[in-house]
Interface confidence: low
């Protein structure tokens, strides 16, 4: 570590005196910073010497010496005071620039350490500091304004009490710059716009920045628009607003509008699309199939997307039948607005009952007229089966009726013994009816089919079973011939 002679850390001299500062190290040494012309600098072996024959108040400052070859990078310093009764201050810089919330050093150095007790900081021409100005003083460095604020960017003077009167330094201008975190904040409203040809429209592009130095413009497709700019300042931010007002829109006004703002940190842009239409429109669509099938007892949401301009004047869900005159519970209908011109309407149908199958229509109206979208809801049912013994054209016949949706298919089984249901081990014969007769097939209702098994004689210790199944489930009915006629068994519940 280098050593300075005299040993310091402070040296007080009078104006006109000769001052010699010698720095000695193990290797070569050098003095930091720019050395004013009043000093003579020469090397003497491993030492470097600063000398002046005529010290002035302007030589007041800290002198630091370093040894470049020292791996520890040590340095030594001495602070020189040139005690001038007429010049209590040596101002090193007339302008200081800092960012907001940084400490601002106003480098007015006291030329006489004895004066430290009577120093103060004032604004130009002795005006007091702004309230909440938090500062401290160091005789070696000057005044420090802590966490400087933008509003504290002012002209300051350092004041010292000499012989009962205040002596001011020359002024120091402090510039406090706002910290610009990024490009200006932008808003472009509306985010999307639709107008009918001939209507009025307004697009507002606004940008805000913490500093006044920024630009904003509105662009239509690739054309930069010449629009008067309104400026404002609120919430500690500078605002610039461009308002495009169109009294009567036409198709050439349609297209992409971009709001672009820039500052020293860069550029920020946001866009919106303006659509001009010939007349009012109202479009209904669904991502779902309009023909829906759901198993009885389950739930379903019917969803309709609406695009409309002008806005909707009314909308509702209606049940069109055929089973009852009930109408959808309003609590089951839900509306969400995706954006200004797009909406989603949902009808929730929980635990569907047989009487709730049928047509559901969503109707909406705007000045363009009415539109409707109709869903057809069919319920799926597992088959229900019954078997009766009858005589057809003198022949004994087993008649199986199966009812369900989708249409059930029918299989007959003959098995040994008397049983409520044939299991695989007992099965003697299987007949599949490829084309059972359809007895009824009404929209939104179960399909009822009938299958006949003609038998001249039914063997008494055997069971005949009719089985029906569809995509939802299956059902069966067992028939056991007995001497007194016949008896049947429905399946176990």
């Amino acid at each position: 570590i280098p050593v300075i002679e005299p040993s310091g850390p402070e040296l007080v001299v009078k104006p006109g005196e000769t001052v010699t500062l010698r720095c000695v190290g193990n290797g070569s040494v050098e003095w930091d910073g720019p050395i004013s012309p009043h000093w003579t600098l020469y090397s003497d072996g491993p030492s470097s010497v600063l000398t002046t024959n005529n010290a002035t108040f302007q030589n007041t400052r800290t002198y630091r010496c370093t040894e470049p070859g020292d791996p520890l990078g040590g340095s030594a310093a001495i602070h020189l005071y040139v005690k001038d009764p007429a010049r209590p201050w040596n101002v090193l810089a007339k302008e200081v620039v800092v960012f907001e919330d940084q400490d601002a050093l106003l480098p007015c150095l006291l030329t006489d350490p004895v004066l430290e007790a009577g120093v103060s900081l004032v604004r130009l021409r002795g005006r007091p500091l702004l309230r909440h100005t938090n500062y401290s003083f160091s005789p070696w460095h000057g005044f420090i304004i802590h966490r400087a604020k933008f509003i504290q960017g002012q002209d300051y003077q350092c004041s010292a009490l000499m012989g009962g009167r205040k002596v001011m330094s020359i002024s120091i201008r402090l510039k406090v710059q706002k910290v610009i975190p990024g490009p200006p904040a932008l808003t472009l409203v509306p985010a999307e716009l639709v107008r009918i040809r001939g209507e009025a429209a307004q697009i507002v592009c606004s940008a805000s920045n913490i500093d006044v130095d920024f630009d904003v413009f509105l662009q239509h497709n690739t054309t930069k628009l010449a629009i008067p700019q309104r400026s404002d300042f609120h919430d500690n931010r500078y605002q610039k607003v461009l308002t495009l007002s169109l009294g009567q829109v036409d198709f050439q006004h349609a297209g992409n509008y971009s709001c672009v703002a820039s500052n020293v940190q860069g550029k920020h842009s946001t866009s919106m699309f303006f659509q001009v239409v010939e007349s009012a429109y109202l479009d209904l669509s669904s991502e779902q199939n309009l023909i829906q099938e759901v198993t009885v007892g389950e739930g379903l949401n019917l969803k309709v997307m609406v695009e409309a301009y002008p806005g909707l004047q009314g909308f509702n869900w209606t049940y069109l039948g055929p089973f009852s005159d009930h109408q959808p519970e309003p609590k089951l209908a839900n509306a969400t607005t995706k954006d200004t011109y797009r909406h989603t309407f949902t009808l929730s149908l929980p635990r569907l009952k047989p009487s709730e199958a049928g047509r559901y229509s969503f109707l909406a109206r705007n000045p363009g007229g009415w539109r409707a979208l109709t869903f057809e809801l069919t319920l799926r049912y597992p088959p229900e089966v019954s078997v009766i013994w009858t005589s057809i054209n003198g022949s004994g016949t087993l008649l199986c009726a199966a009812s369900g949706y989708p249409q059930p298919n029918v299989t007959w089984l003959q098995c040994a013994g008397h049983t409520d249901r044939c299991d695989e081990a007992q099965v003697l014969q299987v007949w599949v009816d490829p084309h059972p007769e359809v007895l009824s097939q009404e929209p939104f209702q179960k399909v009822t089919v009938q299958s006949l098994l003609t038998a001249e004689t039914l063997e008494h210790n055997q069971t005949y079973e009719c089985r029906a199944h569809n995509s939802v489930g299956s059902g069966s009915w067992a028939f056991i011939p007995i001497s007194a006629g016949a008896r049947t068994h429905p399946p176990d519940e």
Partner: antibody
């Protein structure tokens, strides 16, 4: 071009009703409201109401509710205004006028129908 | 109900001079930057004719000597210069709120 052709003058007795017509041509009939406006001799203009031909919906000035009934026949592109229980106060010229969406001005007018209520 | 008060009730203007007609609304109205105030001209025995729509827009085919201005509650129709054909009654009308209402009219005569 857009035209609104109104029916001819009417001379009616107090207490009777009168049905005026306004036939539209030259534009998509169902897209625009048809308004009716009353003007008494030497007086100003008074809005009666509008009918929306697409679905027959109406909007009336409260003052004329029950007095006027607005209907539309889209097949003949004709709008009707029936005025009931006529008194001498109903003697006036009645105009039909086309407007577009809410806020649009009455850009096209019929020539007017003079109704005279007299015993 | 918005009441529109026109002034003056009548005025006489020399040819090639300026005519100014005022229309004051009983309450301020403005909708999305649109001012639904319109001006009509009516000559004896004829239906009204649209001159200005939305306060300041000139209807197609109307001479440029007609102009409209104003916002909120105070609106003005200006004819400059007046021509012989402009002798008529002028009405303001608001389409902002039901019931739609007209001003009482201003009769323009030529000196």
């Amino acid at each position: 071009q857009v035209q609104l052709q109104q029916s001819g003058p009417e001379l009616v007795k107090p207490g009777a009703s009168v049905k005026l017509s306004c036939k539209a041509s030259g534009y998509t009939f169902t897209t625009y409201d048809i308004n009716w406006v009353k003007q008494r001799p030497g007086q100003g203009l008074e809005w009666i109401g509008w009918v929306y031909p697409r679905d027959g919906s109406t909007k009336y000035n409260e003052k004329f509710k029950g007095k006027a009934t607005l209907t539309v026949d889209t097949s003949s592109r004709t709008v009707y205004m029936e005025f009931h229980s006529l008194t001498s106060e109903d003697s006036a010229v009645y105009f039909c006028a086309r407007s577009g969406l809410t806020g649009s001005p009455f850009a096209y007018w019929g020539q007017g129908t003079l109704v005279t209520v007299s015993a | 109900k918005i009441v529109l008060t026109q002034s003056p009730a009548s005025l006489a203007v020399s040819l090639r001079q300026r005519a100014t007609i005022s229309c004051r609304a009983s309450e301020s109205f403005d909708s999305y930057g649109n001012t639904f105030m319109h001006w009509f001209q009516q000559k004896s025995g004829q239906p009204p004719k649209l001159l200005i729509y939305r306060a300041s827009n000139l209807e197609s085919g109307v001479p440029a000597r007609f102009s409209g201005s104003g916002s909120r509650t105070d609106f003005t129709l200006t004819i400059d210069p007046v021509e012989a054909d402009d002798a008529a009654t002028y009405y303001c009308q608001q389409n902002n709120e039901y019931p739609l209402t007209f001003g009482s009219g201003t009769k323009l005569e030529l000196k």
